[in-house]
């Protein structure tokens, strides 16, 4: 038995969970997925059994050896996979676990304003990035991008202060998660303080 | 220093298949999508493909697809599996990084040529 | 695949001249734009991304604007070393595509 293989995988994607097996005589093979059985082979007679019938299409076995495929990721086959040797020359099952994370391809990230103040000339107020459909293990990072800054900044909420005055700044939120990054439609300072001046209720921008 | 060195490439016959890689160094790999790039002679660039740093996802040029493969280890390597080559894929192969993971690309490496002949 | 044209394919100037290339992206971009020079024989080199924004160790003298659709690199000051061919990328959707180059000269 092996330490736990942590495997990463995007919705409508493929994984391979890798099994390298020093075992001679097998007698079957079992894969289960949160306890659940999943796939049984048995190597003599060239038997592969699929539990569920909709794993069927999805489940393959490269090359002739046994190592699991599993095709046509969904989001809720992220789990604990669990492997079992077993044969009449091993006193007990060799096995084998694996932590599968399956991640969702992100769209454009939404920003959102916060409640914005203009006192003696500046602008201030928070831009808040999301995921629309709340898609997990997100990472936002701003840009600030203009003539005096090219700033970087972490998390997805961006305070912001801004100069009536003062050069323009364009911001744009950078969405990433372990499969994917996408980045927002960029946010000008000059507009988004005009309009603020206009609507002091928080609004999507 | 930062580095991306190509090798792999030469003279194929229409075709062959070969086999490119891309050795990274000055830089924790493991963190960065990337990214191969091709140029044909006198000609533009061409991006073909890209993978993250788990290879869990691969995006390529959709007209590139079918013939091209990129992966990687965790070894300091990417790699682009050519197949069924065709004089047109004569060019130049450069493995490049965007700059701080974004998409564009601050860092080239020398790249190789590929030459499709008979 | 999101086409981008620029132009023009070439041009001559004098050193001190302003030079402006474009490149005009078949659909709206936003601002994801990146430029890039490429000297003879040499692997290209990042200018500009963002449309605007200068890679670090950019002279000033380059310089990038625009948004949606039409986009300009602007050198102000031609230099000798300015020879090189420069492309734009847009990086807004899959594929990532190139424009076809604009090779500058020196008259």
């Known amino acids: 038995s092996g330490p736990v293989k942590e495997l990463v995988g995007s919705v409508g994607g493929a994984v391979t969970f890798p099994l390298k097996s020093k075992v001679k005589q097998v007698d079957s093979i079992v894969w289960t997925f949160n306890t659940t059985p999943l796939v049984t082979i048995q190597p003599e007679g060239g038997t592969i059994i699929v539990t569920q019938n909709r794993n069927r299409e999805r489940v393959d076995f490269p090359d002739g050896g046994y190592s699991l495929k599993l095709s046509k990721l969904k989001k809720n086959d992220s789990g604990i996979y669990y492997v079992g040797i077993y044969s009449s020359s091993l006193q007990q099952p060799s096995t084998q676990e694996y932590v599968l994370h399956v991640y969702e391809h992100l769209s454009k990230p939404k920003v959102t304003m916060g409640l914005q103040s203009n006192k003696n000339g500046t602008c201030v107020t928070n831009l808040t990035c999301c995921m629309e459909h709340g898609e997990e293990d997100v990472i936002y990072t701003w840009k600030a991008l203009g003539q005096a800054a090219n700033e970087s900044h972490n998390g997805s909420i961006l305070p912001i202060s801004w100069r009536w005055g003062e050069s323009d700044m364009t911001f744009i939120c950078v969405a990433r998660n372990p499969v994917s990054r996408n980045f927002s439609s960029p946010i000008l300072a000059r507009k988004l303080c005009e309009g603020a001046a206009d609507d002091p209720d928080s609004s999507m921008v | 220093e930062v580095q991306l060195v190509e090798s792999g490439g030469g003279l194929v016959q229409p075709g062959g298949s070969l086999r490119l890689s891309c050795a990274a160094s000055g830089f924790d790999f493991s963190r960065y999508w990337m990214s191969w790039v091709r140029q044909a002679p006198g000609k533009g660039l061409e991006w073909i493909g890209e993978?993250?740093?788990?290879?869990?996802?691969i995006n390529y040029a959709p007209s590139l697809k079918d013939k091209f493969i990129i992966s990687r280890d965790n070894a300091k390597s990417l790699y682009l599996q050519m197949n069924s080559l065709r004089a047109e894929d004569t060019a130049v192969y450069y493995c490049?990084?965007?700059?701080?993971?974004?998409?564009?690309?601050?860092?080239w490496g020398q790249g190789t040529l590929v030459t499709v002949s008979s | 695949d999101i086409q981008m044209t620029q132009s023009p394919s070439s041009l001559s100037a004098s050193v001190g001249d302003r030079v402006t290339i474009t490149c005009k992206a078949s659909q709206d971009v936003g601002i994801a734009v990146a430029w890039y020079q490429q000297k003879p024989g040499k692997v290209p080199k990042l200018l500009i991304y963002?449309?605007?924004t200068r890679h670090t160790g950019v002279p000033d003298r380059f310089s990038g604007s625009g948004s949606g659709t039409d986009f300009t690199l602007t050198i102000s000051s031609l230099q000798p070393e300015d020879v090189a061919t420069y492309y734009c990328q847009q990086y807004s959707s899959y594929p990532y595509t190139f424009g076809q180059g604009t090779k500058v000269e020196i008259k």
């Open positions: 490049a990084r965007p700059d701080g993971n974004y998409w564009y690309f601050d860092v």
């Open positions: 963002w449309a605007s």
């Open positions: 993978i993250n740093p788990d290879s869990s996802t």
